[in-house]
């Protein structure tokens, strides 16, 4: 009868219990991007900070090479903000040169990649037309919901335009994701 | 070997367990502000509602003084949007008079103030340029991401422009933070 | 003394501990809405994908005729990002016949039905005038909070024209809770 | 269209206490904050207080012991009380409500004159 | 307590006429000023706000300017409908104390 004591917390517990401050978490913060030819209708990936100012990675949740990897199933909060900028879009020049207005767009998407699929899955998709009269624009791209991940399982943030993200600053533009 | 049967669930456990429901928890919600005058490149502290309608505060985490007070270090969740309107932006008046388009902006910045560091540190921001065309316009920013807080911590959400602030309703402007 | 061991793992739990993989979450995804007819000044609400793709429900938390049914008592953080879109908005045809400039809106509302209580409450709301130059327009509004819900209330995302949600992919237009 | 009407009794003796009560008809009551102001014979608009819509209250320092403002969100109706009147409190009281624009009143009421006589 | 002082107390003048009211505040309210028209017998009318944005409704023949401190009202081309008592208030402080100016008679000529 020693233990009794502690059974009303573990009756309605069906899986392990597991200290929250164990749990696999990362917020990483943007840097300067390197110019990449990418193929038409393929965004080009982001790549990040991970251990300087606010960035970080713990309990096993690991970045490399544009990717956070998942190391242990189950379901995880996934977020990142994307502040992009510009000069005057293409939209307002042809608006101006009194051509059809085809607005302009950024784009960001968070991609998880799995090894065993063939194609990656896109998670999140914030996307906005940008057709601003101002010369100099900019504006945040906000995304974050939750999703059932696997052991393995990579992540990573894509864009349209690599050019017009903003990266001069950490507060402006992140990724992050941590286990629930 | 009483007690053995509840072995297997602490033995990936390095920080003490805790109940959900005890954690530090915060929503607050809008309320009028108090103009301010502030200087140049600081921008003002909003205050919140925190005890009525949807906003409260529990498990120790305080609010007082525009600051949510952090009871204890760990990973937090940390959100804010803010509703700005405003009649017709400076932009677009600027260029109904020919002059130079330099656009309007409006800015969230969530900060927090640690006492033993001088300066406070800028956890999230998101701005935008507005140029707008009609009179009246009105939009959010939203913001949310996850860093590693220290007790004692104090946040807070500052905006470029406190007249511009969207106080009427506690659904669309709000500021809230909890532990992971 | 034989249970003694994992006495101080519980001395700070007020509450029963849970796992955490078994708490109620959902993700809905976007599925094609079927236009309604909704009085003036009341938003018609989503219907959703719960099952397939993306999306899931698990552990109680169960989707029905447009509502997600939250199955036990907490704090919950809860989410949705619409994304809208549309051609030429009204505000610039407005302004085009040289009219007042009465802008074009959309509006995304999470809304808390509670079945003792006669008025539904909005959550959280995200509201953005649209007065766009260009031809084709399209933008997304994200939304999440935490709040504390009651065993049997109902959540519902309505938004200002339903006509306008783009329902072509499930990572532009979601709904989504978890318990804390 | 939005219209406010209100109601009370208009004549009271020194100590008593006034009270008034504004409905709202034909648009939202969530969503904005609510006033009273009062006009003494012959002389100027002075504000006496407001109630937001999570029922948080906001009186005019000079007055605040003596003043209640309550909310009935149910029938769309709020209510003013101003405790211990005295001649100085005689005026013509109205209902207002604040556009969203910092106390700027759109829409007000018809205006209940209060006598405080013995 | 931030005073507002209007001037003229009282002015007339002719339909069509062009007029301008001030409004001087004890310390700087940025743009926290709206204007009222009040009609004997009636409620107050908001016609401007935050010193200068048009309320819905509103004639355009009504104008505001102005910033800090010093503030106008502007009718243009006068109506007989205008004639009546303007109040200007600034909506800075919070809770406002003494928030009306003592009014600007406009009476016909």
């Known amino acids: 009868l020693k233990g009794q004591e502690f059974a009303p917390s573990h009756q309605q517990v069906y899986a392990p219990l597991r200290a929250d401050g164990d749990k696999p978490r990362a917020h990483l913060t943007v840097v300067r991007q390197t110019p990449t030819q990418h193929f038409k209708n393929q965004f080009p990936a982001l790549h990040w900070e991970h251990e300087l100012g606010l960035a970080f990675t713990k309990n096993r949740m690991n970045y490399t090479n544009k990717f956070l990897l998942i190391p242990e199933s189950g379901d995880y909060f996934i977020y990142s903000q994307v502040t992009f900028r510009g000069m005057t879009s293409e939209c307002s020049e042809i608006r101006q040169a009194g051509r059809p207005n085809k607005p302009d767009s950024i784009t960001v998407v968070i991609t998880k990649v799995t090894d065993s699929y063939p194609e990656p899955t896109q998670l999140l998709m914030g996307t906005k037309s940008v057709c601003e009269v101002g010369s100099n624009w900019f504006q945040p791209i906000y995304l974050g919901a939750m999703f059932s991940l696997q052991e393995g399982d990579k992540l990573m943030v894509n864009v349209s335009d690599i050019s017009l993200v903003d990266y001069t600053k950490e507060d402006k533009t992140f990724f992050g994701a941590f286990l629930l | 070997l009483k007690g053995q049967e509840f072995a297997p669930s602490h033995q990936q456990v390095y920080a003490p367990l805790r109940a959900d429901g005890d954690k530090p928890r915060a929503h607050l919600t809008v309320v009028r502000q108090t103009p301010t005058q502030h200087f140049k490149n600081q921008f003002p502290a909003l205050h919140w509602e925190h005890e009525l309608g949807l906003a409260f505060t529990k498990n120790r985490m305080n609010y007082t003084n525009k600051f949510l007070l952090i009871p204890e270090s760990g990973d937090y969740f940390i959100y804010s949007q803010v509703t700005f309107r405003g009649m017709t932006s400076e932009c677009s008046e600027i260029r109904q008079a020919g002059r130079p388009n330099k656009p309007d902006s409006i800015t969230v910045v969530i900060t927090k103030v640690t006492d033993s560091y001088p300066e406070p540190t800028q956890l999230l921001m998101g701005t935008k340029s507005v140029c707008e065309v009609g009179s009246n316009w009105f939009q959010p920013i939203y913001l949310g991401a996850m860093f590693s807080l220290q007790e004692g911590d104090k946040l807070m959400v500052n905006v470029s422009d406190i007249s511009l602030v969207d106080y009427t309703k506690e659904d669309k402007t709000f500021f809230g933070a909890f532990l992971l | 003394l034989k249970g003694q061991e994992f006495a101080p793992s519980h001395q700070q739990v007020y509450a029963p501990l849970r796992a955490d993989g078994d708490k109620p979450r959902a993700h809905l995804t976007v599925v094609r809405q079927t236009p309604t007819q909704h009085f003036k000044n009341q938003f018609p609400a989503l219907h959703w994908e719960h099952e397939l793709g993306l999306a899931f429900t698990k552990n109680r938390m169960n989707y029905t005729n447009k509502f997600l049914l939250i199955p036990e008592s907490g704090d919950y953080f809860i989410y949705s990002q619409v994304t809208f879109r549309g051609m030429t908005s009204e505000c610039s045809e407005i302004r085009q016949a040289g009219r007042p400039n009465k802008p074009d809106s959309i509006t995304v509302v999470i809304t808390k039905v509670t079945d003792s209580y006669p008025e539904p409450t909005q959550l959280l709301m995200g509201t953005k005038s649209v007065c766009e130059v260009g031809s084709n327009w399209f933008q997304p509004i994200y939304l999440g909070a935490m709040f504390s819900l009651q065993e049997g209330d109902k959540l519902m995302v309505n938004v200002s024209d339903i006509s306008l949600v783009d329902y072509t992919k499930e990572d532009k237009t979601f709904f989504g809770a978890f318990l804390l | 269209q939005v219209q406010l009407q209100q109601w009370g009794a208009g004549l009271l003796k020194p100590s008593e206490t006034l009270s008034l009560t504004c409905a709202v008809y034909g648009g939202s009551f969530s969503g904005y904050y609510w006033s009273w102001i009062r006009q003494p014979p012959g002389k100027g608009l002075e504000w006496i207080g407001e109630?937001?819509?999570?029922?948080?209250?906001n009186y005019k320092p000079s007055l605040k012991s003596r003043v209640t403002i309550s909310v009935d969100t149910s029938k769309n109706q709020f209510s003013l009380k101003l405790s211990s009147v005295t001649a100085a409190d005689t005026a013509l009281y109205y209902c207002a409500r604040d556009n969203g624009w910092h106390y700027a009143f759109d829409i007000w009421g018809q205006g209940t004159m209060v006598t405080v006589s013995s | 307590d931030i005073q507002m002082t209007q001037s003229p107390s009282s002015l007339s003048a002719s339909v069509g006429d062009r007029v301008t009211i001030t409004c001087r505040a004890s310390?700087?309210?940025?743009?926290?000023l709206n204007w009222y028209q009040q009609r004997p017998g009636k409620a107050p009318n908001l016609l401007l706000f935050?010193?200068?944005s048009l309320q819905s409704g509103v004639p355009s023949r009504f104008s505001g300017s102005g910033s800090g401190t010093d503030f106008t009202l502007t009718i243009n081309s006068l109506q007989p409908e205008d004639f009546a008592t303007y109040y200007c208030q600034q909506s800075y402080s919070n809770p406002p104390e003494s928030s009306f100016g003592q009014g600007t008679k406009l009476e016909i000529k």
């Open positions: 310390q700087n309210i940025s743009s926290y």
């Open positions: 935050t010193a200068s």
């Open positions: 109630i937001n819509p999570v029922g948080r209250t």
